[in-house]
């Protein structure tokens, strides 16, 4: 008799794939454009990334540091009208992309939360949650919660409103903090909150430290759903050298939880390579004409157009990983087991019941390494086979689909491998 199948966990839409942040509509669209109507025209691109949700804005009216001239119910006319927003929502729904609205109040000002008028602002947020839920948004984001007085209490209240409307609605809180104590304290008192933080950006880009941060976080949060990113808003290139971008994409897509990216992460968008562009929101490089300021500054391989035509590009890797993440049970909701593979390496297994299993091996170092996979660290339910098929490598040159002997696994500098192997009873 075949063994009983493990009961599938209840999965919300944000469990099924990545979220994509567009914090600055103008920078995302470029060419002096940057409104909701223009964004609607980019939804096909978002579909091609296989992302499940779009975190948008803030787009509400906000006169810098003026609480009286901040209206969370009104869209800033520079971005469009309520009708444009409704139209965007409808189009996004048709493409199965959920829309999360950022309601960080004073996004143009010094202090995101008008620290001297917290109660006034909190009331505005409450009204806005109810208004935009009725309008059909799928969730909300609020950032810089480290500056929000009594954040935990307010978030609990806002979570109640959001979940009270529908269990299918999401509240995301963002912080620049990387303090695990504060993170865990907030998560303990706000059960279904999704939190983005700078926790992982402290990793110092080493395998041992990253492994330690990830496992510490997962052990501490237990079986609650979490999200993975390097910050609440910034690009991966703000924290990582170019040679580690592929490795981090592979890791973020294969850890248990929701990966959260900022627009441009999929192409390695780097403000430092675009003179005069703001670090927090550089112009998106759709093609070579997206940054006309300095002729020749942008080459084809830095753009969406150029990378779309190159199967070995970062964008192509992002699309493949996003696709795998959204359809493989072991990556959707599988168990996670990290184990030793040698200095500089971080390796783990994702597995769910009798479904295909995945092995991830990441070499954070700048020298090639032989992986000494310590299978003895793993529980019996997650044992390693002698060979596994190479699904993809972050570096070109490997033959995909070929079986690799796990005892003789060698990784190039900064290489990450995603291998698959079948369940064996």
């Amino acid at each position: 008799r075949a063994p009983r199948c493990r009961e599938l966990p209840a999965q919300k839409w944000w469990h099924t794939g990545a979220l994509y942040r567009i914090g600055d509509l103008q920078a995302f669209q470029g060419h002096g454009a940057g409104n909701l109507a223009g964004l609607k025209g980019r939804l096909d691109y978002l579909s091609s990334l296989k992302v499940k949700g779009l975190v948008l804005g803030p787009i509400h009216k906000n006169q810098k540091d003026d609480v009286a001239q901040t209206d969370l119910l009104q869209i800033d006319p520079n971005f469009g009208s309520k009708e444009d927003f409704d139209s965007l929502l409808q189009s996004a729904k048709k493409k199965s992309i959920r829309v999360i609205l950022d309601l960080t109040p004073n996004y143009r000002g010094e202090n995101s939360w008008f620290s001297t008028q917290v109660d006034t602002v909190a009331t505005k947020v409450k009204d806005a949650l109810e208004f935009w839920l009725q309008a059909g948004v799928d969730g909300f984001q609020v950032r810089d919660i480290e500056n929000l007085k009594d954040a935990s209490s307010f978030l609990a209240e806002w979570q109640n409103i959001t979940k009270g409307f529908s269990e299918d609605r999401l509240l995301i809180a963002g912080t620049n903090s990387s303090d695990l104590q504060q993170i865990l304290s907030l998560l303990e008192s706000n059960k279904d909150l999704l939190l983005t933080s700078s926790y992982l950006s402290d990793s110092g880009s080493t395998g041992e430290h990253t492994k330690s941060l990830v496992t510490q976080y997962l052990n501490a949060t237990g079986n609650r759903w979490c999200s993975w990113s390097l910050s609440q808003a910034r690009l991966l290139t703000s924290f990582l050298p170019a040679q580690l971008l592929r490795l981090y994409q592979l890791m973020l897509f294969t850890l248990p939880g929701t990966p959260v990216f900022s627009y441009g992460d999929e192409i390695g968008l780097d403000a430092a390579a675009l003179p005069g562009q703001p670090m927090e929101a550089p112009v998106m490089l759709w093609d070579e004409s997206s940054f006309p300021d300095i002729p020749g500054a942008v080459s084809a391989n830095m753009t969406v157009k150029g990378q779309s035509e190159d199967p070995g590009s970062l964008l192509s890797l992002f699309r493949r990983l996003s696709d795998q993440r959204s359809k493989e049970r072991s990556l959707l909701h599988g168990d996670f087991h990290a184990f030793s593979a040698g200095p500089g390496l971080f390796s783990y297994i994702r597995h769910w019941d009798q479904n295909e299993r995945f092995l991830v091996v990441l070499n954070f170092g700048d020298v090639g390494l032989s992986a000494g996979l310590q299978a003895s660290d793993l529980p019996a339910s997650a044992s390693l086979p002698a060979k596994a098929d190479l699904l993809l490598s972050t570096q070109p040159g490997r033959e995909e689909g070929s079986p690799l002997e796990l005892e003789r696994l060698k990784l190039e500098p900064h290489e990450g491998l995603l291998l698959r192997f079948p369940y064996a009873a």
Partner: antibody, heavy 119, light 107 residues
Framework: DVKLVESGGDLVKPGGSLKLSCAAS????????MSWVRQTPEKRLEWVAT????????YFPDSVKGRFTISRDNAKNTLYLQVSNLKSEDTAMYYC????????????WGQGTTLTVSS | DILMTQSPSSMSASLGDTVSITCHAS??????IGWLQQKPGKSFKGLIY???NLEDGVPSRFSGSGSGADYSLTISSLESEDFADYYC?????????FGGGTKLEIK
């Protein structure tokens, strides 16, 4: 109004033990991390312990690790500090304080309770 | 551990004066600093959190500034109730650490 009231301080011999308490009111106790901070007779401030809102995670400086235990009873709105294997350098005024939690960073303090370690 | 060097350790000023107290951290603390007030024989009161944010009920003559490793607390138009001890605290990294304190006395 937020109120924190410590109790339990006493004169204890070196090597002895004691349990300090802090009764909280005026806020949703279970939503906040809580900490103990001490002030030495020379008026120097030292962080002693922190516990997360649900009580699952605790943090200590090396100077008290293994000797002090922080706990909480959210149903009773009470924070505790169990101190043991006491040394003379533990002599101080012990304060209970709210935070650090996001947006709340040691914002409210109790009036303190005195612990004297002496033979 | 992060060392918080607070200066001056004591100062005297007159009513109506503006004074500044500084704290230097031994490494960058990304605005994860608070300022506390302790009146003689009393407990502590939070004044400023995250470098610049005023705690509830704190008069606007108190302000905080700084970035990286250097921060300051400024009190403008000193009033009689402001003469007290002031401490900075960093909560960027464990163990949380405090400055040595500044005693502000009336001239």
């Amino acid at each position: 109004d937020v109120k924190l009231v410590e109790s339990g301080g006493d004169l204890v011999k070196p090597g002895g033990s004691l349990k300090l308490s802090c009764a909280a009111s005026g806020f949703t106790f279970s939503s906040y991390s809580m900490s103990w901070v001490r002030q030495t007779p020379e008026k120097r401030l030292e962080w002693v312990a922190t516990i997360t809102s649900g009580g699952s995670y605790t943090y200590f400086p090396d100077s008290v690790k293994g000797r002090f235990t922080i706990s909480r009873d959210n149903a009773k709105n009470t924070l505790y500090l169990q101190v043991s294997n006491l040394k003379s350098e533990d002599t101080a005024m012990y304060y209970c304080t709210r935070g650090p939690s996001f947006g709340n960073y040691l914002d409210y303090w109790g009036q303190g309770t005195t612990l004297t370690v002496s033979s | 551990d992060i060392l918080m060097t607070q200066s001056p350790s004591s100062m005297s000023a007159s009513l109506g004066d503006t004074v500044s107290i500084t704290c230097h951290a031994s490494q960058g603390i990304s605005s994860n600093i608070g300022w506390l007030q302790q009146k003689p024989g009393k407990s502590f009161k939070g004044l400023i959190y995250r470098g610049t944010n005023l705690e509830d009920g704190v008069p606007s003559r108190f302000s905080g500034s700084g970035s990286g490793a250097d921060y300051s607390l400024t009190i403008s138009s000193l009033e009689s109730e402001d003469f007290a001890d002031y401490y900075c605290v960093q909560y960027a990294h464990f163990p949380y650490t405090f400055g040595g304190g500044t005693k502000l006395e009336i001239k």
